[in-house]
Protein backbone atom coordinates (compact mmCIF):
# COMPACT_ATOMS: atom_id res chain seq x y z
CA UNK A 1 0.00 0.00 0.00
CA UNK A 2 1.25 3.48 -0.87
CA UNK A 3 1.39 5.56 2.29
CA UNK A 4 3.81 8.27 1.21
CA UNK A 5 3.08 11.85 0.26
CA UNK A 6 4.95 14.30 -1.93
CA UNK A 7 5.49 17.77 -0.56
CA UNK A 8 6.42 20.42 -3.11
CA UNK A 9 7.08 24.13 -3.10
CA UNK A 10 3.67 24.52 -4.80
CA UNK A 11 3.22 27.72 -6.78
CA UNK A 12 6.43 29.73 -7.04
CA UNK A 13 7.60 32.80 -8.91
CA UNK A 14 10.98 34.05 -10.02
CA UNK A 15 12.38 36.91 -12.05
CA UNK A 16 13.39 36.65 -15.68
CA UNK A 17 17.13 36.03 -15.95
CA UNK A 18 17.27 34.64 -12.43
CA UNK A 19 17.31 31.07 -11.16
CA UNK A 20 14.99 28.89 -9.12
CA UNK A 21 15.25 25.60 -7.25
CA UNK A 22 12.54 23.02 -7.93
CA UNK A 23 12.24 20.82 -4.87
CA UNK A 24 10.03 17.91 -3.90
CA UNK A 25 10.18 15.83 -0.74
CA UNK A 26 8.76 12.35 -0.22
CA UNK A 27 7.59 11.67 3.32
CA UNK A 28 5.52 9.19 5.36
CA UNK A 29 6.98 6.10 3.71
CA UNK A 30 9.96 3.84 4.26
CA UNK A 31 10.11 3.04 0.53
CA UNK A 32 13.50 3.40 -1.10
CA UNK A 33 13.77 6.14 -3.74
CA UNK A 34 15.51 4.62 -6.76
CA UNK A 35 14.90 7.31 -9.38
CA UNK A 36 13.47 10.82 -9.66
CA UNK A 37 12.28 12.28 -12.98
CA UNK A 38 11.84 16.01 -13.48
CA UNK A 39 9.45 16.68 -16.33
CA UNK A 40 7.21 19.12 -18.08
CA UNK A 41 4.02 17.84 -19.66
CA UNK A 42 5.68 16.98 -22.94
CA UNK A 43 9.37 16.68 -22.21
CA UNK A 44 11.78 15.31 -19.73
CA UNK A 45 14.21 17.76 -18.13
CA UNK A 46 16.34 15.48 -15.98
CA UNK A 47 16.59 12.10 -14.31
CA UNK A 48 18.41 11.27 -11.12
CA UNK A 49 18.95 7.52 -10.90
CA UNK A 50 20.40 5.91 -7.77
CA UNK A 51 22.79 3.77 -9.84
CA UNK A 52 23.40 5.89 -12.92
CA UNK A 53 23.50 9.37 -11.39
CA UNK A 54 22.12 12.45 -13.14
CA UNK A 55 21.04 12.75 -16.75
CA UNK A 56 20.13 16.21 -18.04
CA UNK A 57 18.21 16.49 -21.33
CA UNK A 58 20.40 18.08 -24.04
CA UNK A 59 17.71 20.74 -24.60
CA UNK A 60 18.24 21.98 -21.05
CA UNK A 61 21.96 21.28 -20.49
CA UNK A 62 22.95 24.95 -20.56
CA UNK A 63 20.28 26.09 -18.12
CA UNK A 64 19.65 23.20 -15.75
CA UNK A 65 21.88 22.09 -12.90
CA UNK A 66 21.34 18.98 -10.79
CA UNK A 67 20.54 19.45 -7.12
CA UNK A 68 20.52 20.40 -4.41
CA UNK A 69 19.79 16.82 -3.39
CA UNK A 70 17.12 15.37 -5.63
CA UNK A 71 15.98 18.86 -6.64
CA UNK A 72 16.69 20.74 -9.82
CA UNK A 73 18.02 24.25 -10.38
CA UNK A 74 16.73 26.21 -13.39
CA UNK A 75 18.96 29.09 -14.47
CA UNK A 76 18.71 32.03 -16.89
CA UNK A 77 14.94 31.93 -16.64
CA UNK A 78 12.78 33.22 -19.48
CA UNK A 79 9.07 33.97 -19.55
CA UNK A 80 8.68 30.80 -21.64
CA UNK A 81 9.73 28.77 -18.58
CA UNK A 82 6.41 29.65 -16.95
CA UNK A 83 4.32 26.50 -16.47
CA UNK A 84 3.97 23.21 -14.67
CA UNK A 85 6.89 21.05 -13.55
CA UNK A 86 6.50 17.54 -12.22
CA UNK A 87 8.68 15.45 -9.95
CA UNK A 88 8.13 11.71 -10.33
CA UNK A 89 9.59 9.58 -7.56
CA UNK A 90 10.20 5.94 -8.44
CA UNK A 91 10.29 3.93 -5.24
CA UNK A 92 10.61 0.36 -4.10
CA UNK A 93 8.34 -1.28 -3.17
CA UNK A 94 5.63 1.40 -3.35
CA UNK A 95 5.79 2.43 -7.02
CA UNK A 96 5.61 6.01 -8.28
CA UNK A 97 4.69 9.18 -6.42
CA UNK A 98 4.19 12.43 -8.30
CA UNK A 99 4.19 16.10 -7.38
CA UNK A 100 3.42 19.32 -9.21
CA UNK A 101 5.06 22.74 -9.06
CA UNK A 102 3.79 25.78 -10.94
CA UNK A 103 6.48 28.29 -11.85
CA UNK A 104 5.66 31.83 -12.93
CA UNK A 105 8.56 33.77 -14.43
CA UNK A 106 8.04 37.52 -14.05
CA UNK A 107 9.64 40.42 -15.82
CA UNK A 108 12.35 41.90 -13.62
CA UNK A 109 11.44 44.79 -11.30
CA UNK A 110 13.41 47.21 -13.47
CA UNK A 111 11.49 46.15 -16.54
CA UNK A 112 8.20 46.40 -14.65
CA UNK A 113 8.97 49.94 -13.48
CA UNK A 114 10.13 50.92 -16.93
CA UNK A 115 6.89 49.66 -18.40
CA UNK A 116 4.90 51.84 -16.04
CA UNK A 117 6.86 55.02 -16.94
CA UNK A 118 4.92 57.20 -19.33
CA UNK A 119 6.06 60.36 -21.10
CA UNK A 120 3.54 63.11 -20.29
Amino acid sequence: MMTGTIETTGNISAEKGGSIILQCHLSSTTAQVTQVNWEQQDQLLAICNADLGWHISPSFKDRVAPGPGLGLTLQSLTVNDTGEYFCIYHTYPDGTYTGRIFLEVLESSVAEHGARFQIP
Partner: antibody, heavy 121, light 107 residues
Framework: QVQLQQSGAELVRPGTSVKVSCKAS????????IEWVKQRPGQGLEWIGV????????NYNEKFKGKATLTADKSSSTAYMQLSSLTSDDSAVYFC??????????????WGQGTLVTVSA | DIVMTQSHKFMSTSVGDRVSITCKAS??????VAWYQQKPGQSPKLLIY???YRYTGVPDRFTGSGSGTDFTFTISSVQAEDLAVYYC?????????FGGGTKLEIK
Protein backbone atom coordinates in the same frame (compact mmCIF):
# COMPACT_ATOMS: atom_id res chain seq x y z
CA GLN B 1 -12.03 1.12 -11.83
CA VAL B 2 -10.59 3.17 -14.66
CA GLN B 3 -12.29 2.54 -17.99
CA LEU B 4 -11.99 4.11 -21.42
CA GLN B 5 -14.93 3.17 -23.66
CA GLN B 6 -14.53 4.01 -27.33
CA SER B 7 -17.17 4.43 -30.02
CA GLY B 8 -17.88 1.68 -32.52
CA ALA B 9 -16.33 0.87 -35.89
CA GLU B 10 -16.79 3.36 -38.73
CA LEU B 11 -16.94 2.83 -42.48
CA VAL B 12 -16.42 6.21 -44.17
CA ARG B 13 -15.92 7.63 -47.65
CA PRO B 14 -12.64 9.17 -48.84
CA GLY B 15 -12.53 12.95 -48.40
CA THR B 16 -14.99 12.96 -45.51
CA SER B 17 -14.41 13.28 -41.75
CA VAL B 18 -15.00 11.02 -38.78
CA LYS B 19 -15.18 11.70 -35.05
CA VAL B 20 -14.10 8.98 -32.61
CA SER B 21 -15.13 9.23 -28.96
CA CYS B 22 -13.53 7.96 -25.77
CA LYS B 23 -15.71 8.02 -22.65
CA ALA B 24 -13.77 7.92 -19.39
CA SER B 25 -15.08 6.56 -16.10
CA UNK B 26 -13.73 5.54 -12.71
CA UNK B 27 -11.57 8.64 -12.16
CA UNK B 28 -11.59 12.45 -12.26
CA UNK B 29 -11.60 13.09 -16.01
CA UNK B 30 -10.07 16.57 -15.89
CA UNK B 31 -7.06 15.46 -13.85
CA UNK B 32 -5.43 13.16 -16.40
CA UNK B 33 -4.14 13.63 -19.92
CA ILE B 34 -5.70 11.60 -22.74
CA GLU B 35 -3.45 10.34 -25.52
CA TRP B 36 -4.41 9.02 -28.96
CA VAL B 37 -2.53 6.28 -30.82
CA LYS B 38 -2.94 4.91 -34.36
CA GLN B 39 -2.39 1.31 -35.44
CA ARG B 40 -2.67 0.36 -39.09
CA PRO B 41 -3.66 -3.27 -39.80
CA GLY B 42 -0.78 -5.56 -38.96
CA GLN B 43 1.44 -2.57 -38.18
CA GLY B 44 2.99 -0.88 -35.17
CA LEU B 45 1.83 1.98 -32.97
CA GLU B 46 1.98 5.69 -33.82
CA TRP B 47 1.38 8.47 -31.32
CA ILE B 48 -1.06 11.09 -32.64
CA GLY B 49 -1.24 13.57 -29.80
CA VAL B 50 -2.41 14.39 -26.30
CA UNK B 51 -5.14 16.55 -24.76
CA UNK B 52 -5.49 17.99 -21.28
CA UNK B 53 -9.25 17.66 -20.64
CA UNK B 54 -9.04 20.20 -17.82
CA UNK B 55 -7.63 23.05 -19.89
CA UNK B 56 -8.35 21.89 -23.44
CA UNK B 57 -4.65 22.32 -24.23
CA UNK B 58 -3.17 19.83 -26.65
CA ASN B 59 0.02 18.77 -28.36
CA TYR B 60 0.19 16.97 -31.69
CA ASN B 61 2.69 14.80 -33.46
CA GLU B 62 3.76 17.03 -36.37
CA LYS B 63 2.73 14.24 -38.75
CA PHE B 64 -0.91 14.50 -37.63
CA LYS B 65 -1.28 18.28 -37.53
CA GLY B 66 -4.13 19.21 -39.86
CA LYS B 67 -5.32 15.60 -39.90
CA ALA B 68 -6.41 15.07 -36.28
CA THR B 69 -8.23 17.48 -33.97
CA LEU B 70 -8.44 16.58 -30.29
CA THR B 71 -11.19 17.94 -28.04
CA ALA B 72 -12.77 17.04 -24.72
CA ASP B 73 -16.18 17.55 -23.13
CA LYS B 74 -15.91 17.83 -19.36
CA SER B 75 -19.64 17.46 -18.77
CA SER B 76 -19.73 13.98 -20.30
CA SER B 77 -16.14 12.96 -19.43
CA THR B 78 -15.54 12.24 -23.09
CA ALA B 79 -12.52 12.90 -25.29
CA TYR B 80 -12.90 13.15 -29.05
CA MET B 81 -10.61 12.84 -32.02
CA GLN B 82 -11.80 14.14 -35.38
CA LEU B 83 -9.97 12.97 -38.50
CA SER B 84 -10.48 15.04 -41.64
CA SER B 85 -9.91 14.65 -45.42
CA LEU B 86 -9.80 10.90 -45.02
CA THR B 87 -7.77 8.69 -47.35
CA SER B 88 -7.02 4.96 -47.35
CA ASP B 89 -3.89 5.74 -45.29
CA ASP B 90 -6.20 6.69 -42.43
CA SER B 91 -7.74 3.21 -42.30
CA ALA B 92 -6.58 1.96 -38.91
CA VAL B 93 -7.54 1.15 -35.36
CA TYR B 94 -7.40 4.25 -33.16
CA PHE B 95 -6.83 3.95 -29.42
CA CYS B 96 -7.28 6.45 -26.64
CA UNK B 97 -5.07 5.94 -23.61
CA UNK B 98 -4.41 7.50 -20.22
CA UNK B 99 -1.20 7.98 -18.30
CA UNK B 100 -0.79 6.02 -15.09
CA UNK B 101 -0.27 8.96 -12.75
CA UNK B 102 -1.98 12.30 -12.46
CA UNK B 103 1.28 14.12 -13.16
CA UNK B 104 3.04 11.08 -14.52
CA UNK B 105 5.37 10.46 -17.40
CA UNK B 106 4.04 9.53 -20.83
CA UNK B 107 3.74 5.81 -20.32
CA UNK B 108 0.23 4.65 -21.07
CA UNK B 109 -1.34 2.54 -18.35
CA UNK B 110 -4.99 2.46 -19.43
CA TRP B 111 -6.24 1.91 -22.97
CA GLY B 112 -9.59 2.01 -24.72
CA GLN B 113 -10.62 -1.05 -26.71
CA GLY B 114 -9.85 0.68 -30.00
CA THR B 115 -12.04 2.00 -32.82
CA LEU B 116 -11.62 0.61 -36.32
CA VAL B 117 -11.94 3.28 -39.01
CA THR B 118 -12.18 1.97 -42.57
CA VAL B 119 -11.94 4.44 -45.44
CA SER B 120 -13.44 3.04 -48.61
CA ALA B 121 -15.34 4.26 -51.62
CA ASP C 1 12.02 12.54 -33.72
CA ILE C 2 13.58 9.74 -31.70
CA VAL C 3 13.55 6.47 -33.63
CA MET C 4 13.07 3.26 -31.65
CA THR C 5 14.35 0.18 -33.44
CA GLN C 6 13.42 -3.39 -32.56
CA SER C 7 15.73 -5.42 -34.75
CA HIS C 8 13.78 -8.69 -34.54
CA LYS C 9 10.30 -8.68 -36.06
CA PHE C 10 9.77 -12.27 -34.92
CA MET C 11 11.20 -14.44 -32.18
CA SER C 12 10.45 -18.10 -31.68
CA THR C 13 10.68 -19.69 -28.25
CA SER C 14 9.40 -22.63 -26.21
CA VAL C 15 7.38 -22.68 -23.01
CA GLY C 16 9.75 -22.41 -20.04
CA ASP C 17 12.51 -20.73 -22.06
CA ARG C 18 14.10 -17.38 -21.25
CA VAL C 19 13.75 -14.84 -24.05
CA SER C 20 15.11 -11.31 -24.48
CA ILE C 21 13.83 -8.64 -26.87
CA THR C 22 16.02 -5.67 -27.66
CA CYS C 23 15.25 -2.08 -28.55
CA LYS C 24 17.64 0.67 -29.64
CA ALA C 25 16.96 4.41 -29.43
CA SER C 26 18.43 6.78 -32.03
CA UNK C 27 19.62 9.09 -29.23
CA UNK C 28 20.22 8.93 -25.48
CA UNK C 29 16.86 8.62 -23.71
CA UNK C 30 18.35 7.84 -20.29
CA UNK C 31 15.88 5.37 -18.71
CA UNK C 32 12.72 6.75 -20.32
CA VAL C 33 11.51 3.60 -22.05
CA ALA C 34 8.31 1.61 -21.59
CA TRP C 35 7.38 -1.87 -22.82
CA TYR C 36 3.91 -3.03 -23.88
CA GLN C 37 2.36 -6.38 -24.67
CA GLN C 38 -0.36 -6.61 -27.32
CA LYS C 39 -2.22 -9.86 -27.77
CA PRO C 40 -4.17 -10.52 -31.00
CA GLY C 41 -7.33 -8.40 -31.16
CA GLN C 42 -6.58 -6.61 -27.90
CA SER C 43 -5.31 -3.20 -26.78
CA PRO C 44 -1.68 -2.82 -25.71
CA LYS C 45 -0.95 -3.47 -22.04
CA LEU C 46 1.75 -1.63 -20.08
CA LEU C 47 4.34 -4.00 -18.58
CA ILE C 48 7.43 -1.90 -17.84
CA TYR C 49 8.06 1.84 -17.50
CA UNK C 50 11.25 3.85 -16.95
CA UNK C 51 13.25 0.95 -18.44
CA UNK C 52 13.08 -1.36 -15.43
CA TYR C 53 10.00 -0.66 -13.30
CA ARG C 54 7.29 -3.31 -13.43
CA TYR C 55 3.80 -1.84 -13.63
CA THR C 56 1.23 -2.80 -10.98
CA GLY C 57 0.05 -6.39 -11.27
CA VAL C 58 2.59 -7.43 -13.90
CA PRO C 59 4.08 -10.89 -13.17
CA ASP C 60 7.71 -10.84 -12.05
CA ARG C 61 8.82 -13.06 -14.93
CA PHE C 62 8.75 -9.83 -16.98
CA THR C 63 11.76 -7.56 -16.49
CA GLY C 64 13.33 -4.62 -18.27
CA SER C 65 16.84 -3.22 -18.28
CA GLY C 66 19.07 -0.73 -20.05
CA SER C 67 19.80 2.98 -20.24
CA GLY C 68 21.02 5.46 -22.81
CA THR C 69 20.27 3.90 -26.19
CA ASP C 70 20.13 0.14 -25.57
CA PHE C 71 17.23 -1.57 -23.83
CA THR C 72 16.23 -5.16 -23.18
CA PHE C 73 12.93 -6.74 -22.22
CA THR C 74 13.17 -10.25 -20.78
CA ILE C 75 10.68 -13.01 -20.00
CA SER C 76 12.45 -15.36 -17.60
CA SER C 77 10.19 -18.35 -18.21
CA VAL C 78 7.88 -18.05 -21.19
CA GLN C 79 4.27 -19.16 -20.71
CA ALA C 80 1.83 -20.05 -23.50
CA GLU C 81 -0.19 -16.89 -22.73
CA ASP C 82 2.86 -14.72 -23.51
CA LEU C 83 2.21 -15.17 -27.24
CA ALA C 84 1.93 -11.53 -28.30
CA VAL C 85 3.64 -8.59 -29.96
CA TYR C 86 5.93 -6.57 -27.66
CA TYR C 87 6.59 -2.88 -28.26
CA CYS C 88 9.09 -0.48 -26.74
CA UNK C 89 8.23 3.22 -26.46
CA UNK C 90 10.30 6.21 -25.46
CA UNK C 91 8.70 8.59 -22.95
CA UNK C 92 11.65 10.96 -23.07
CA UNK C 93 10.32 13.60 -25.45
CA UNK C 94 7.48 14.51 -27.77
CA UNK C 95 6.47 13.03 -30.12
CA UNK C 96 6.30 9.75 -28.25
CA UNK C 97 7.60 7.00 -30.52
CA PHE C 98 7.29 3.23 -30.51
CA GLY C 99 9.46 0.46 -31.83
CA GLY C 100 8.12 -1.60 -34.73
CA GLY C 101 7.23 -4.51 -32.46
CA THR C 102 8.57 -8.01 -31.92
CA LYS C 103 6.14 -10.90 -32.34
CA LEU C 104 6.81 -13.70 -29.89
CA GLU C 105 5.86 -17.09 -31.29
CA ILE C 106 5.62 -20.21 -29.19
CA LYS C 107 7.14 -23.33 -30.76
Amino acid sequence: QVQLQQSGAELVRPGTSVKVSCKASGYAFTNYLIEWVKQRPGQGLEWIGVINPGSGGNNYNEKFKGKATLTADKSSSTAYMQLSSLTSDDSAVYFCARRGDKYGSAWFAYWGQGTLVTVSA
Amino acid sequence: DIVMTQSHKFMSTSVGDRVSITCKASQDVSTAVAWYQQKPGQSPKLLIYSASYRYTGVPDRFTGSGSGTDFTFTISSVQAEDLAVYYCQQHYSSPRTFGGGTKLEIK
